[in-house]
């Protein structure tokens, strides 16, 4: 008796839903009375499905209302675990344990990404020096580097600072500021850069005509 996994690594997005799967051999019709399926994430119990009944009493509180075994898949030899509203804390090594005549288990690693998609921006000016402060703020995970470039997409020199804090959902709240001498209609870009391909997000900041503090813009591309 052997359990197999179509994939042993899932990379999922924060807030999305995921379904992870373990396959087991079923000949003809499934005998629910003989089937035991356990899903665990490290020392947390997620699913205990024993002889056709799910025992919710033992389910870890962090998975309550979010995790379910797709029972219609069992007859196909597929023990599929669905988790909704994926959180950063859902990252880790999962295990499906299946007993159906014999017993076996497999591990599945889940990684959770939160792209820095929504970039908030602000521009302010010091009337005494005409120095502009450009600020970009976004939430995501894991750590991102903020890169400032000009309209030619060349790095910009200037005094910069970065602050990072944690949100309630354990995302990283990254705020980067850049102080530069600039004139009206100059264009700057802040890019939240991550090493994985397709994980970079950029906002465009245009120096306004008036030397005043402007409300946050949300233009991104």
């Amino acid at each position: 008796f052997t359990v197999t996994v179509p994939k042993d690594l899932y990379v999922v997005e924060y807030g999305s839903n995921m379904t992870i799967e373990c396959k087991f051999p079923v000949e003809k019709q499934l005998d629910l009375a003989a089937l035991i399926v356990y899903w665990e994430m490290e020392d947390k119990n997620i699913i205990q499905f024993v002889h056709g009944e799910e025992d919710l009493k033992v389910q870890h509180s962090s998975y309550r209302q979010r995790a379910r075994l797709l029972k219609d898949q069992l007859s196909l030899g597929n023990a599929a675990l669905q988790i909704t509203d994926v959180k950063l804390q859902d990252a880790g090594v999962y295990r499906c344990m299946i007993s159906y005549g014999g017993a076996d288990y497999k591990r599945i690693t889940v990684k959770v990404n939160a792209p820095y998609r929504k970039i908030n921006q602000r521009i302010s000016v010091d009337p005494a020096t005409s120095e502009h402060e450009l600020i970009c703020q976004a939430e995501g995970y894991p750590e991102a580097e903020v890169i400032w470039t000009n309209s030619d997409h060349q790095p910009v020199s200037g005094k910069r600072s970065v602050t990072t804090s944690r949100t309630e959902g354990m995302l990283l709240n990254v705020t980067s500021s850049l102080r530069v001498n600039a004139t009206a209609n100059d264009v700057f870009y802040c890019t939240f850069w991550r090493s994985q391909p397709g994980q970079n997000h950029t906002a465009e900041l245009i120096i306004p005509e008036l030397p005043a503090t402007h409300p946050p813009q949300n233009r991104t591309h």
Partner: antibody
């Protein structure tokens, strides 16, 4: 803190059976697997079998016919039973916490078993 | 069963030396490889889990590397208390299997 403690007979006559109890504290058997490992005098480590959180077991094929592992979650106890012992079963027998996502992180102090008439 | 080939079987080194012990698996282990230290007359203790992660309380002079079928345990700046036998163990599949051990002695 996490502890595992084996209790066994010490001496077993050839062809007789061996029963060892492992009592754990500081964690629950519903959250961690337990493996049994033995070490003959002056030799290396040999994995005998494991019992999973859900009660499923897996045995080293070399011992499958004469080894049985069970547990009582409520008493925090794991039991090893091995039949038909011979002199080459003389060893220190360890119970070990063996989380599937980590490694064998906590070991009992071991119980010495001598098979002799 | 996955065979674990550990070398050398014994090793003599001087205090302050850096030594390496290797473990070769007959099948792909991904990162499911652990290293244990057993001092004379003592129980085995976990040093490294998942190929390269230091277990709590283990000195940083111990390090592990590798993935797939080839793995290495490195001890830098050898100390007298490092005299022990070292074992690798695969956790990729059942039955769990150990390397034959490397007995480390101080010159």
């Amino acid at each position: 803190q996490v502890q595992l403690k084996e209790s066994g007979p010490g001496l077993v006559a050839p062809s007789q059976s061996l029963s060892i109890t492992c009592t754990v504290s500081g964690f629950s058997l519903t959250s961690y697997d337990i493996s049994w490992i033995r070490q003959p005098p002056g030799k290396g480590l040999e994995w005998l079998g494991a019992i999973w959180t859900g009660g499923g077991t897996n045995y080293n094929s070399a011992f499958m016919s004469r080894l049985s592992i069970s547990k009582d979650n409520s008493k925090s106890q794991v039991f090893l039973k091995m039949n038909s012992l011979q002199t080459d079963d003389t060893a220190i027998y360890y119970c070990v916490r063996d989380p599937y996502y980590y490694a064998m992180d906590y070991w009992g102090q071991g119980t010495s078993v001598t098979v002799s008439s | 069963d996955i065979q674990m080939n550990q070398s050398p079987s014994s090793l003599s080194a001087s205090l302050g030396d850096t030594i390496t012990i290797t473990c070769h698996a007959s099948q792909n282990l991904n990162v499911w490889l652990s290293w244990y230290q057993q001092k004379p007359g003592n129980i085995p203790k976990l040093l490294i889990y998942k190929a390269s992660n230091l277990h709590t309380g283990v000195p940083s002079r111990f390090s592990g590397s590798g993935s797939g079928t080839g793995f290495t345990l490195t001890i830098s700046s050898l100390q007298p208390e490092d005299i022990a036998t070292y074992y690798c163990q695969q956790g990729q599949s059942y039955p769990r299997t150990f390397g034959g051990g490397t007995k480390l002695e101080i010159k």
